[in-house]
Amino acid sequence: GPVPPSTALRELIEELVNITQNQKAPLCNGSMVWSINLTAGMYCAALESLINVSGCSAIEKTQRMLSGFCPHKVSAGQFSSLHVRDTKIEVAQFVKDLLLHLKKLFREGQFN
């Protein structure tokens, strides 16, 4: 059957932990992505930011997992209003910020 939302979120959190702890060199060669507002619709916005990073195997699983939380198809070059379009940050910082926010969502029972 389908994976419960709580399990899916926990698995996403654990994948982000793995990414942050396995950094030997700069994540995705120091690629920059648009910062996002960590609010409703945040999963799609996060995917829209990360999907523009190509050739980075470290975040491919994260991209796939985020797509499971986003109700519509996301493709490169697509942007929502949730992006802070004047602020770009390194993928590593983006992942750390997203991880902390997801841990708080998990605590609050916001699994979707």
């Epitope: 926990r10 959190i13 932990v17 902390l100 916001q110």
Partner: antibody, heavy 122, light 108 residues
């Protein structure tokens, strides 16, 4: 100001019972999860258990499960810890602690009482 | 049940930086809180949610949480920082709150 005041500590024989109380003031008691934490002399902190804001759920440390019961009376802003079948290893300072309530009780303990000493000895 | 491992003691000279670690399996997936306890007193929250600081706590205190290790960092250590420090997480698999064993910070 916001305050938690424990009472009911003392010396008790092994196998006997004791009831601790905690009076809360200065904040909206019914909106907080409430925990008990204990500290044996010269030892570290040990979580005892939690009761949710509305009293609907309790969780206990394995070391006290089946012997200790946490209750609360939101109309009187009081938290209780009923301790039965006490053992020497239950000797400790017992702290009443509050934590904001979410779906999980994973919030930090932002207010502590001064603690009350429980000594289990024959 | 979930286990948090802290070094029993850390020593540092005044003005230097103290780092107190808290190890746990994939602790980075959990929200970590830190408490300071001075002799004869109740613990005080110094860091919550990995890296947030209560308003009354000096900026010298900071926290991080990556992989299997959370770290409490105290910069420009003062004699008044000498205390026991405890990390804490909620283990959602057992519905238990868990404390580390505590670390005694000694200011030389």
């Amino acid at each position: 100001q916001m305050q938690l005041v424990e009472s009911g500590g003392g010396v008790v024989q092994p196998g006997r019972s004791l009831r601790l109380s905690c009076a809360a003031s200065g904040f909206e008691f019914r909106t907080y999860g409430m925990h008990w934490v204990r500290q044996a002399p010269g030892k570290g902190l040990e979580w005892v258990g939690v009761i949710w804001d509305d009293g609907s759920n309790t969780h206990y440390a394995d070391s006290v499960k089946g012997r200790f019961t946490i209750t609360r009376d939101n109309s009187k802003n009081t938290l209780n810890l009923q301790m039965n079948s006490l053992r020497a290893e239950d000797t400790a300072v017992y702290y009443c602690v509050r934590a904001p309530q979410w779906y999980l009780t994973a919030e930090a303990f932002d207010l502590w009482g001064q603690g009350t000493m429980v000594t289990v000895s024959s | 049940s979930y286990i948090l491992t802290q070094p029993p003691s850390v020593s540092v000279a005044p003005g230097q930086t103290a780092r107190i670690t808290c190890g746990g399996n994939l602790i980075g997936a959990k929200l970590v809180h830190w408490y300071q306890q001075k002799p004869g007193q109740a613990p005080v929250l110094v860091i919550y949610d990995d890296s947030d600081r209560p308003s009354r706590i000096p900026e010298r205190f900071s926290g991080s949480n990556i992989g299997n290790t959370a770290t409490l960092t105290i910069e420009r250590v003062e004699e008044g920082d000498e205390a026991d420090y405890y990390c804490q997480v909620w283990d959602y698999s057992s519905d238990h709150m868990v404390f580390g064993g505590g670390t005694k910070l000694t200011v030389l």
